[in-house]
Each structure stands twice: as C-alpha cells, then as structure tokens.
Amino acid sequence: SGTTNTVAAYNLTWKSTNFKTILEWEPKPVNQVYTVQISTKSGDWKSKCFYTTDTECDLTDEIVKDVKQTYLARVFSYPAGNVESTGSAGEPLYENSPEFTPYLETNLGQPTIQSFEQVGTKVNVTVEDERTLVRRNNTFLSLRDVFGKDLIYTLYYWKSSSSGKKTAKTNTNEFLIDVDKGENYCFSVQAVIPSRTVNRKSTDSPVECMGQEKGEFREI
C-alpha cells in the first residue's frame, strides 16, 4: 500500500512565550501531510492544522482556554493525496508530544521599561504590563493579570560610569529606588517566576538610561 513511505513525526517540541504556543516537529514532509490533535489529560482530542505540510502548528487558541491545565498533543502522518489511508494496524501513524502546562512552562517574554521618572534622589521605574493572548470576559489579560503575585520583576540598575549592577525587586510593575544625586543611571528589568522549577527568568529588557527620552527628571 501507499502507506509504507509514511514516517512518524519526531522531536515534538513546545515553543511558547507569554502563552503564544506552537508545537514543532520533524521531519519536513516528503509525500506526506500532518494533522495535529490536542487534549487535556481528561478531555477529548481536538484536531488542528488539518493535512498540513508545515512542521509546526499554532495551538495558542486551545491552551489559553485554561493555562493551568496540562496538555498533550499528537501529530498524525498521512500519505499525501491519500489521507484516508491508514497504517498497517488500521491507524494512521502518530507521535505524542511531551506534556505541557502553560502556566508553569511558557517562556517569559522580554519585558520593556515603559518609563522612569526621577524626583530628587528617588527614581520610579515602570515596567510595561505586556498583553497576552489569554482571554477573560472577551478581554485579553496582561501578564500580571495571569500570574498575579507569582510574577516578580528584578531591576538591575547601575551608574553610567560603572559596571556593577545593583538589584531591586517588585511584585507590581513599579520600582522606587534610591540614587545618588547628580549621577546618571541605566536600567534593565528581568521577569521572574520564583515558584517555577524551569523557565524561571526572562531575557533582560533593553537597557534604558537617564538622559534619554523615556525618562523624566524633576528637581525637588
């Protein structure tokens, strides 16, 4: 039969940042197509990316329904042009993905410093509350909405003239730090979820320095 050339998908990998979640796999198809199914541990299978020649499938819409659930996906392989055909056991070939729990495993996206304001020897640094694709009551939730106090930010700040980075932490999106009068400082933030065992930290935000446009200085 024509199924003998169909190969099972392998290296199924979840790629997820701020809940935007894509399943990737190999190999690039030769005379075959793929369909993906996703399910929670207790739920029914839902098919996505029907008969595709891609080696990735965006499953964001499914996982954002409940980011605390654990999901399993599987990738079915079919002969191109003969998708009704099945393998020798009467089933199309398929491979299971690793389990994936978005709340625990999605990578934290690179944060952005929204603004900073100096008032005397205090600086208030505000982190942008990034929007996710998780919805509640028809509105998109921010990262803070989803993670609450589980999400903290670490601020690295240093004098423009030196390299040593002091740190501050917040479980809101604002920092208030003490600085030396007359010194210019640079800032970078990192998102952290301390309760996690993997993917605990984000990459650092772009560096912002005093004396640039984002900041405001007020002498008291």
Epitope: K149, I152, T154, Y156, S163, G164, K165, K166, T167, A168, K169, T170, N171, D178, Q190, V192, P194, R196, T197, V198, R200, K201, T203, D204
Partner: antibody, heavy 121, light 107 residues
C-alpha cells in the same frame, strides 16, 4: 539533591591570584543567583559579591571591587570567583550560596562547605 | 549601605530557655530579612526568611518577627543542638548586609 561544592582555596602570597570554583548540582544555576560570602577567622559573615548567571550581571562589595571578578559557566553549572591582588585581610573561608526568592524577598537556601584562602608571605 | 545592628553579641542560656535575638536595620527593609545559624567549621544554614517564614525542615521552636525596622529571632525552648552563632541579614538593597552575629553558649 541540591549541592554546592567550592574548590580552589589554598595558601597564596600577598599580591597573588587565586580562582575559586563553585560547582552546582541538582539545579541549574542560570535559574538562580549565586553569591559569594567570606568569613575571616573568628569573625562574622561578609558579603563579597553576586552573579546572575542568566545574564552575567554582577556587583561587588567595596572591599573587593576592582580586584575580584565573579563569572559563571552555565554549561558547566559552575560559578567562579577570580581573586587578584590578594591582601592579608582577604584571608577567610569563602562560601558560595544559592539565592532564591519568596515573593520579592531573597533568601539563600543552599551554601557550599567553604574553602579556605590564606594570604601570607 | 544598610547597617544591621544585632544584639546581644553573645548570651549564655540553658536547655529549655526561651532565647531572643534582635536585629535593627538602619533604614526600612520591609520584610527582606533572613536569619541563619552557623556552627563552628560549618556553612551557615537558613532558618527564617521574609522576616517570619520558617524554612523547610527547621524545627518549629524557631520563629521570626518584625516590628518596623526591628527584627527578632526567638527560640522558644533551647535544645542542645541550638548552641551556635546566629546571623541576621537584609537583602532589601544591594549590597546585602549581615548583623555581627550572636553566639549562643551553654550557661
């Protein structure tokens, strides 16, 4: 099991150099922060510096700034303390410690066994 | 830098005694204070974090509290294995700083 093991201590002459290692097992250092702390004989604990192995950020105590450098090799899951221009007052047991957060409060939950550095002619 | 002033520097007590060690921060440190126990020739061990949270595996006779910038470590009933040196530490700002230590000795 989480473990930190320091090595590299020993006797060195004033002005000399030494590199201490802090090998971690049971966790990935890039997910945490590593601090170095020292304790001179019969004295209290003195913070030396930290590194965030994920991004390389460091900060040092004034007493060692410009002489000591902290680095990390994440594939080897090891942090290092490079000590140059050593002085007699740097004689101490050196510890590395893992820092984690509870909410926004930091705590140092695992410490190495310590390695003795003696600076003497 | 924030100073952590610890008192007393040493104390003598008997098994079963209630022991209190205090630390005063030179400025507000919120709850960012931890307490460590150290025995001779050993590394410090975490007892209390976030001013009042008992670290996993630490006996419940240890407790921590905060009143403004004053922090207290209490051992409700001193046991033979509790004779050691205790340090407070703040990590509200960089650099983190330790108290000078309190040596708890057998009376």
């Amino acid at each position: 099991e989480v473990q930190l093991v320091e090595s590299g201590g020993g006797l060195v002459q004033p002005g000399g150099s030494l590199r201490l290692s802090c090998a971690a097992s049971g966790f990935t250092i890039s997910g945490y922060w590593i601090h170095w702390v020292r304790q001179a004989p019969g004295k209290g604990l003195e913070w030396v510096g930290y590194i965030d192995p994920y991004n390389g950020a460091t900060y040092y105590a004034d007493s060692v700034k410009g002489r000591f450098t902290i680095s990390a090799d994440t594939p080897k899951n090891t942090a290092y303390l490079q000590m140059n221009s050593l002085r007699a007052e740097d004689t101490a047991v050196y510890y590395c410690a893992r820092a984690d957060y509870h909410g926004v409060d930091e705590y140092w939950d695992y410490w190495g066994q310590g390695t003795l550095v003696t600076v003497s002619s | 830098d924030i100073q952590m002033t610890q008192s007393p520097s040493s104390l003598s007590a008997s098994v079963g005694d209630r022991v209190t060690i205090t630390c005063r921060a030179s400025q507000d440190v919120n709850t960012a204070v931890a307490w460590y126990q150290q025995k001779p020739g050993k590394a410090p061990k975490l007892l209390i974090y976030s001013a009042s949270f008992l670290y996993s595996g630490v006996p419940s006779r240890f407790s921590g509290s905060r009143s403004g910038t004053d922090f207290t470590l209490t051992i409700s009933s001193l046991q033979p294995e509790d004779f050691a040196t205790y340090y407070c530490q703040q990590h509200y700002t960089t650099p983190p700083t330790f108290g000078q230590g309190t040596k708890v000795e057998i009376k």
